[in-house]
């Protein structure tokens, strides 16, 4: 069962998560990114089902395209290279789901832009901690 | 409504050069990054340049690269492209385009203007 | 340089489904869009996302992309459809907008 500080510690982790994708959406979604509606074009692939830490997995699948999206924006937007923004996620992502049991993504049929893309993971997160709260 | 007029096109010759203006309406044109396009006489279309909603940042297809700069008047609610050292596969008719913020494309475009470069 | 490739030209009776398609390698990771265009007038877009439509666009305009396919079909296409018609996407890194060389669509 989970103890009290285990539970906390996932909790932070989510929270670390969840400001990080906020703050590549508000870099990125503002008139300000002249890159945005280049970033628009990239096809992200959003989990069918998104209600357990082990879905998470789907999230790790698609870091190396949120990558190569981020690359385009100007390094001012972000306080990080999009490199070691994605790496510090991937640690996060990494640690919450645990690699105990081996989780395959199962994808919706329909795909999304960048920005519907972070905010379902972001309302993910915030749905996550408030469970945990 | 939201419009797009464009002026300036004619015919030049080679090497000479030409200034298109492209007029914005119905819109707040400061929160936008612009584009020009053009599109040769039977030919398909090319993006040639773009410019951020403030003009610090631009962007140039390979082709013009070095002859053409764009920029902006947001006092004036205009974009520019200015055009040096004119070619003859320049010749084409020019639009200007407005990169949408919702979606992956240009949405809203100018009518158009035929710059021809000939001797 | 990026391609994306449609055939030049496609003719079509009134009342007949169209089916224009537009191939590039960046598509699995790419939206395409779809721009008609009229003669004598600018480009208008049709289809956004693969297969969303913007308001104002008949229902008979619907689009569609597999693997490094897209396709855009009129169903019932009428002789106001006939036109240019140019996919687009950006290139693989997403840096630079790119048209497909367009299919003139004829409607007779």
């Known amino acids: 069962a989970p103890t009290s500080s285990s539970t906390k510690k996932t909790q932070l982790q989510l929270e670390h998560l969840l400001l990080d994708l906020q703050m590549i959406l508000n870099g990125i979604n503002n008139y300000k990114n002249p890159k945005l509606t280049r970033m628009l074009t990239f096809k992200f692939y959003m989990p069918k089902k998104a209600t357990e830490l082990k879905h998470l997995q789907c999230l790790e699948e698609e870091l190396k395209p949120l990558e190569e999206v981020l690359n385009l924006a100007q390094s001012k937007n972000f306080h990080l290279r999009p490199r070691d923004l994605i790496s510090n996620i991937n640690v996060i992502v990494l640690e919450l789901k645990g690699s105990e049991t081996t989780f395959m993504c199962e994808y919706a049929d329909e795909t999304a832009t960048i920005v519907e893309f972070l905010n379902r993971w972001i309302t993910f997160c915030q749905s996550i901690i408030s469970t945990l709260t | 409504q939201v419009q797009l007029v464009q002026s300036g096109g004619g015919v030049v010759q080679p090497g000479r050069s030409l200034r298109l203006s492209c007029a914005a309406s119905g819109f707040t044109f400061s929160n936008y990054a612009m584009n020009w396009v053009r599109q040769a006489p039977g030919k398909g279309l090319e993006w040639v340049t773009l410019?951020?909603?403030?003009?610090?940042?631009?962007y140039y297809a390979d082709s013009v690269k070095g002859r053409f700069t764009t920029s902006r008047d947001n006092s004036k609610n205009t974009l520019y492209l200015q055009m040096n050292s004119l070619r003859a596969e320049d010749t084409a008719v020019y639009y200007c385009?407005?990169?949408?913020?919702?979606?992956?494309?240009?949405?809203?475009w100018g009518q158009g203007t035929m710059v021809t470069v000939s001797s | 340089s990026y391609e994306l490739t449609q055939p030049p030209s496609l003719s079509v009776s009134p009342g007949q489904t169209a089916t224009i398609s537009c191939s590039g390698d960046a598509f699995p990771r790419k939206f395409a869009y779809w721009y008609q265009q009229k003669s004598g007038q600018a480009p208008v877009l049709v289809i956004y996302e693969d297969t969303r439509r913007p308001s104002g666009i008949p229902e008979r305009f619907s689009g569609s992309s597999s693997g490094t396919m897209a396709t855009l079909t009129i169903s019932g296409a009428q002789v106001e459809d006939e036109a240019d018609y140019f996919c687009?996407?950006?290139?693989?890194?997403?840096?630079?907008?790119?048209f497909g060389g367009g299919t003139k669509l004829t409607v007779l």
């Open positions: 410019i951020s909603y403030d003009g610090s940042q631009k």
């Open positions: 687009y996407t950006t290139s693989s890194s997403g840096t630079h907008p790119v």
């Open positions: 385009a407005r990169d949408s913020t919702t979606l992956g494309a240009f949405d809203v």
